[in-house]
């Protein structure tokens, strides 16, 4: 058993049929010695008396808010949550496996630049009685500070018969050094509590591996005289790290016909313009990627050819 | 060329070669997780590699003030990785193919380090750790870790030379 926060405790249980469970001793936070009784949740049934209460925690019915009283007055509370371990593996019932980039990916994180700011998100089908708490650091043995905000519900989607809820959090490294080569990864830890179930999820990454630039901005077409060719131009996204002579991007320009099955013409360039042939009913799209490190491409910025 | 006395390197040549190094480093180990070996573990086998750190002067301001500190750090790293790529980790079984990107990467690391430091000038270099794995799969894990680390190193080096070529070239 360990303390998650003041008066909230997590009991770690090996979860299998007829498991013996864990013996837990609760102590009433009071100077009083006599006349103390204990109850669980809203029940008025007295579970025991005395300054300490010993219970055998085996299942969710044994978890909940234990309260010690004296003469009708509440003295203190202890909330017990359960953390299940099945076949040596901690349960992951609360969050959905996003399966990208690999199986058992519960947390996904992205950064728009090298400033040390990043966003993580996760998915669940649970709509109520759900709380999250997020902590982060750079490295684990001698951790350096990363400050995370509160997790918020950022999207709701309907997936078949189910509703899916996306939560996200923004974090900022306290003393970021955008130009340095990272040697210690960022660690993100999410505590999830659903009713009386506790779970924790972790992710470890370098900012360089989660970079995904915003799409190029101000995408424009300029027809070239007496030609089917157009000059496409664009600019670096505002959110990208500066100076651009140091933090450079590379770009992919694509001409795509109306039909998805038409052959796409693609050009790769380090410049912020390119000359392409604009076919009727086609569209021109441009996306960006870090020039020197193969992290994710941005989403496409698009304009119609006409 | 960067010399200990402090003259400028051939920024544009260094830029071109460092950008080529980036491409080769990704051709040498293209995907995280593609070769998903189970015992990858987190034993810190590549902790001893030289990293370009915050105080090394490789940021735009540091380069403007005095590029020598940064260039020396980059040179140190290039020599370190060049030695690693020439060691048993890469020459042992499974042996490299003659025209492989790893082979070209090895040669290019040497090329860029020579651009930075002509014959007769000597900056300190770091000792490479004596890692001599006996099993091919252990060698593969080390290769992947070294190449992943090299990708990060050459990306910073390429940014330095791109910025130098754009703003510090005579």
């Amino acid at each position: 058993i360990w303390e998650l926060k003041k008066d909230v405790y997590v009991v770690e249980l090996d979860w299998y049929p007829d498991a013996p469970g864990e013996m837990v001793v609760l102590t009433c936070d009071t100077p009083e010695e006599d006349g103390i009784t204990w109850t669980l949740d809203q029940s008025s049934e007295v579970l025991g008396s005395g300054k300490t209460l010993t219970i055998q925690v085996k299942e969710f019915g044994d978890a909940g808010q234990y309260t010690c009283h004296k003469g009708g007055e509440v003295l203190s509370h202890s909330l017990l949550l359960l953390h299940k371990k099945e076949d040596g593996i901690w349960s992951t019932d609360i969050l959905k496996d996003q399966k990208e980039p690999k199986n058992k990916t519960f947390l996904r994180c992205e950064a728009k630049n090298y400033s040390g700011r990043f966003t993580c998100w996760w998915l669940t089908t649970i709509s109520t009685d759900l709380t999250f708490s997020v902590k982060s650091s750079r490295g684990s043995s001698d951790p350096q500070g990363v400050t995370c905000g509160a997790a918020t519900l950022s999207a709701e989607r309907v997936r078949g018969d189910n509703k899916e809820y996306e939560y996200s959090v923004e974090c900022q490294e306290d003393s970021a050094c955008p130009a340095a080569e990272e040697s210690l990864p960022i660690e993100v830890m999410v505590d999830a509590v659903h009713k009386l179930k506790y779970e924790n999820y972790t992710s470890s990454f370098f900012i360089r591996d989660i970079i995904k630039p915003d799409p190029p901005k101000n995408l424009q077409l300029k027809p070239l005289k007496n030609s089917r060719q157009v000059e496409v131009s664009w600019e670096y996204p505002d959110t990208w790290s500066t100076p651009h002579s140091y933090f450079s991007l590379t770009f992919c320009v694509q001409v795509q016909g109306k039909s998805k099955r038409e052959k796409k013409d693609r050009v790769f360039t380090d410049k912020t313009s390119a000359t392409v042939i604009c076919r009727k009913n086609a569209s021109i799209s441009v996306r960006a990627q870090d020039r020197y490190y193969s992290s994710s491409w941005s989403e496409w910025a698009s304009v119609p050819c006409s | 060329r960067a010399v200990p006395g402090g003259s400028s390197p051939a920024w544009t040549q260094c830029q071109q070669l460092s950008q080529k190094l980036c491409t080769l480093a990704w051709s040498a180990h293209p995907l995280v997780g593609h070769m998903d070996l189970r015992e990858e573990g987190d034993e810190e086998t590549t902790n001893d590699v030289p990293h370009i750190q915050c105080g090394d002067g490789c940021d735009p301001q540091g380069l403007r003030d005095n590029s020598q500190f940064c260039l020396q750090r980059i040179h140190q790293g290039l020599i370190f990785y060049e030695k690693l790529l020439g060691s048993d980790i890469f020459t042992g079984e499974p042996s490299l193919l003659p025209d492989s990107p790893v082979g070209q990467l090895h040669a290019s690391l040497l090329g860029l380090s020579q651009l930075l430091q002509p014959e007769g000038h000597h900056w300190e270099t770091q000792q490479i750790p004596s890692l001599s794995p006996s099993q091919p799969w252990q060698r593969l894990l080390l290769r992947f870790k070294i190449l992943r680390s090299l990708q990060a190193f050459v990306a910073v080096a390429a940014r330095v030379f791109a910025h130098g070529a754009a703003t510090l070239s005579p």
């Epitope: - | 040498a28 499974p94 490299l96």
Partner: antibody, heavy 120, light 107 residues
Framework: QVQLVQSGAEVKKPGASVKVSCKTS????????ISWVRQAPGQGLEWMGL????????NYGQKVQGRVTMTTDTSTSTAYMELRSLRSDDTAVYYC?????????????WGQGTMVTVSS | EIVLTQSPDFQSVTPKEKVTITCRAS??????LHWYQQKPDQSPKLLIK???QSISGVPSRFSGSGSGTDFTLTINSLEAEDAAAYYC?????????FGQGTKLEIK
């Protein structure tokens, strides 16, 4: 996710040619090669040859040398294997597999296979 | 070319049994020997690479050993889902070659 998706089944007459495609996704095509492996009905696996998408180099197995051509189209991240002068013993499932371009390695990702039947 | 000879060609075994398949190379190939499992109407799947290296997602009951010319694939405590053909493959030199295969049947 890395995927290799092959073209559909083919029925050919002896003496004809067949061209099987293998469309790749989830990785940078030019950073790998493609090997082709075939399996006659009820038989074992036979390596046919390889092509490096990095530099276009090819290497063919002796049994199909002279009748096979392996190519790549980097613009669509697709590899092709063309087998000419087909014979009945070319009836097989043809697989494309990812090939390391740095050192000889195991075949860790396979296409779903393309059945080619040669029959008069 | 390097010839790989597997034995046995066929084996009928009961669940929970320990199974051993051997692969012998006609010349030394170091540790450049890999093992695949192929179920009916499926593509082969990599089980072990470089003689003894486990692959992520492959159950730990599969293990490999050997070097030079003699190699072994061991399945500890066989399960019904392990009914399949098993092939060894050498990548030491071109042309790549495969063993003739071992068919495993569950009694």
């Amino acid at each position: 996710q890395v995927q290799l998706v092959q073209s559909g089944a083919e029925v050919k007459k002896p003496g004809a040619s067949v061209k099987v495609s293998c469309k790749t996704s989830g990785y940078t095509f030019t950073y790998y090669g493609i090997s082709w492996v075939r399996q006659a009905p009820g038989q074992g696996l036979e390596w046919m040859g390889l092509i490096s998408a990095y530099n276009g180099n090819t290497n063919y197995g002796q049994k199909v040398q002279g009748r096979v051509t392996m190519t790549t189209d980097t613009s669509t991240s697709t590899a092709y294997m063309e087998l000419r002068s087909l014979r009945s013993d070319d009836t097989a499932v043809y697989y494309c597999v990812t090939e390391n371009i740095n050192w000889r390695d195991a075949f860790d990702i396979w296409g779903q296979g393309t059945m080619v039947t040669v029959s008069s | 070319e390097i010839v790989l000879t597997q034995s046995p060609d066929f084996q009928s075994v009961t669940p929970k049994e320990k199974v051993t398949i051997t692969c012998r190379a006609s010349q030394t190939i170091g540790s450049s020997l890999h093992w695949y499992q192929q179920k009916p109407d499926q593509s082969p799947k990599l089980l072990i690479k470089y003689a003894s290296q486990s692959i992520s997602g492959v159950p730990s009951r599969f293990s490999g050993s050997g070097s030079g010319t003699d190699f072994t694939l061991t399945i500890n405590s066989l399960e019904a889902e392990d009914a399949a053909a098993y092939y060894c493959h050498q990548s030491s030199s071109l042309p790549y070659t495969f063993g003739q295969g071992t068919k495993l049947e569950i009694k």
